[in-house]
Amino acid sequence: DISEPPLHDFYCSRLLDLVFLLDGSSRLSEAEFEVLKAFVVDMMERLRISQKWVRVAVVEYHDGSHAYIGLKDRKRPSELRRIASQVKYAGSQVASTSEVLKYTLFQIFSKIDRPEASRIALLLMASQEPQRMSRNFVRYVQGLKKKKVIVIPVGIGPHANLKQIRLIEKQAPENKAFVLSSVDELEQQRDEIVSYLCDLAPEAPPPT
């Protein structure tokens, strides 16, 4: 297992599959998108990333989804952070939460290969998809619930889809939402978000 020494006092050593879903719409300027990526990298520094402990995936979504890191990628944590920092700014007109949740359901968590680990999708959203694209939104959220995938929406700024955030929260008590007025609040909320995710994941059983 490729591991590196912890970078911070708080370090989440749990069994967790965590997917970061980044809004690639023009509702975020490129500068704001850079702050969003920095937040993801900062979070990754606080996780014990390895195939045994915390596995991460990073997906940028617009009208489709672009995976930069997969859960099974066997790379050093520092290399995974570097890749996360390389996510390109799409600045597209649309960022479809329905499409990215569908992608999370049918691509990332199609097969549950670590049933002992918690599964969490951190949905970073700053925009609203057109209504025509959101027809199956609830179906995908329910599908994720069936697969025991916790969805944690982080609404950022005035254009985040509060209706969808509330729908996600309604599906399961663990689906706690964080609603921020701008990307500037991400750093303030980071430790609370990491702690919340970490508390949802089980500790490794003691060696027998």
């Epitope: 920095a38 570097r82 920092s85 700014y89 600045g91």
Partner: nanobody
Framework: QVQLVESGGGLVQAGGSLRLSCAAS?????MAWFRQPPGKEREFVAV????????LVAASVTGRFTISRDNAKNMVYLQMTSLKPADTAVYYC??????????????????WGQGTQVTVSS
């Protein structure tokens, strides 16, 4: 190969203003200013993005420093107002071709100028 040349530094009294300029010899993506106070590490000041002109400024200088660019002239500027002795440093212009590294880390930037000294006296 991009070359960056800074100008506009100097000695100024506390509360004063300065405008730093950076001339780029080739095409750049994001352009940033960093500074290195005496005996300290180089730190992020501000960045501007070519795609949409959006900017980020370090919390320590927000409301006092503004970054701007003139794409036609391949120039980037740092307008500094209400200067404090703590702003004394060598100011560097930097540019990036890609995305690797967070916006505030020096590793993100491929090209660097030689620096221009800014001294703020009390």
């Amino acid at each position: 190969q991009v070359q960056l040349v800074e100008s506009g530094g100097g000695l100024v009294q506390a509360g004063g203003s300065l405008r730093l300029s950076c001339a780029a010899s080739g095409r750049t993506k994001d352009m940033a200013w960093f500074r290195q106070p005496p005996g300290k590490e180089r730190e992020f000041v501000a960045v501007i993005y070519s795609s949409d002109g959006s900017t980020l400024v370090a919390a320590s200088v927000t409301g006092r420093f503004t970054i701007s660019r003139d794409n036609a002239k391949n120039m980037v500027y740092l307008q500094m107002t209400s200067l404090k002795p703590a702003d004394t440093a060598v100011y560097y212009c930097a540019s990036s071709r890609g995305y690797s590294g967070t916006y505030y880390s020096t590793s993100r930037y491929d090209y660097w100028g030689q620096g221009t000294q800014v001294t703020v006296s009390s």
